[in-house]
């Protein structure tokens, strides 16, 4: 079963992992995320699904000066184990 | 299991100084993002200041020039030197960790929280 507290956050690169990483701790008190191995995607896990759900808001937006940045719910239940 | 302990906050008149520090009860030295964040009566919590992974700072707009985050390692620390503080700095100011776990796992700490109040 899917966890609504799961986002995937991705579209940034590698380098900039860590400043969105910290944009989206703006929206909900993170529990935990997992990095995707080439550091362009990350799972993100919220304290609430409210939480989650205002991330989910930022789909599509422009972070810093041209990072455009999707955000989904995660659908990959390995994660949620 | 890491705990952080917030202190430093507190009442300042306009254009004075505080220093906050957030202490790790665990090892935070392996930090992957060490950052201070900040929410005011009514409005949404907004990242202050952060130390990124690799070492760069970053910084809100509002706070470029006047506060500075740093770590002290050794000390399990990280500081937030907040110089000509003003009104509008006035809130709940929180610490949030992140560490590495396991590989490209990471967990997230966050402190309680410490009130700053800026009076004109």
């Known amino acids: 079963q899917l966890d609504d507290t799961w986002v995937t956050v991705f579209g940034f690169p590698q380098a900039s992992a860590s400043y969105i990483l910290l944009q989206f701790a703006q929206y909900g008190n993170i529990i935990k995320h997992v990095m995707s191995n080439n550091g362009n995607w990350m799972h993100i896990q919220y304290q609430s699904k409210l939480q989650a759900r205002k991330a989910l808001s930022k789909d599509g937006r422009i972070f810093g000066e041209s990072i455009m940045i999707g955000v989904k719910p995660c659908i990959d239940k390995s994660v949620m184990e | 299991q890491v705990q952080l302990v917030e202190s430093g906050g507190g009442l300042v008149q306009a254009g004075g100084s505080l220093r906050l520090s957030c202490v790790g009860t665990?090892?935070?030295?392996?930090?992957?993002?060490m950052a201070w964040y900040r929410q005011a009566a009514g409005k949404e919590r907004e990242v202050v200041a952060g130390?990124?992974?690799?070492?760069?700072?970053h910084y809100a707009d509002s706070v470029k020039g006047r506060f500075t985050i740093s770590r002290d390692n050794a000390k399990n620390t990280v500081y937030l030197q907040m110089n000509s503080l003003q009104p509008e700095d006035t809130g709940v100011y929180c610490c949030?960790?992140?560490?590495?776990?396991?590989?490209?796992?990471?967990?997230?700490?966050w402190g309680q929280g410490t009130r700053v109040t800026v009076s004109s």
């Open positions: 949030h960790v992140v560490i590495e776990s396991t590989r490209f796992v990471y967990d997230h700490y």
């Open positions: 665990g090892n935070i030295s392996s930090a992957y993002t």
């Open positions: 130390i990124l992974n690799g070492g760069s700072t």
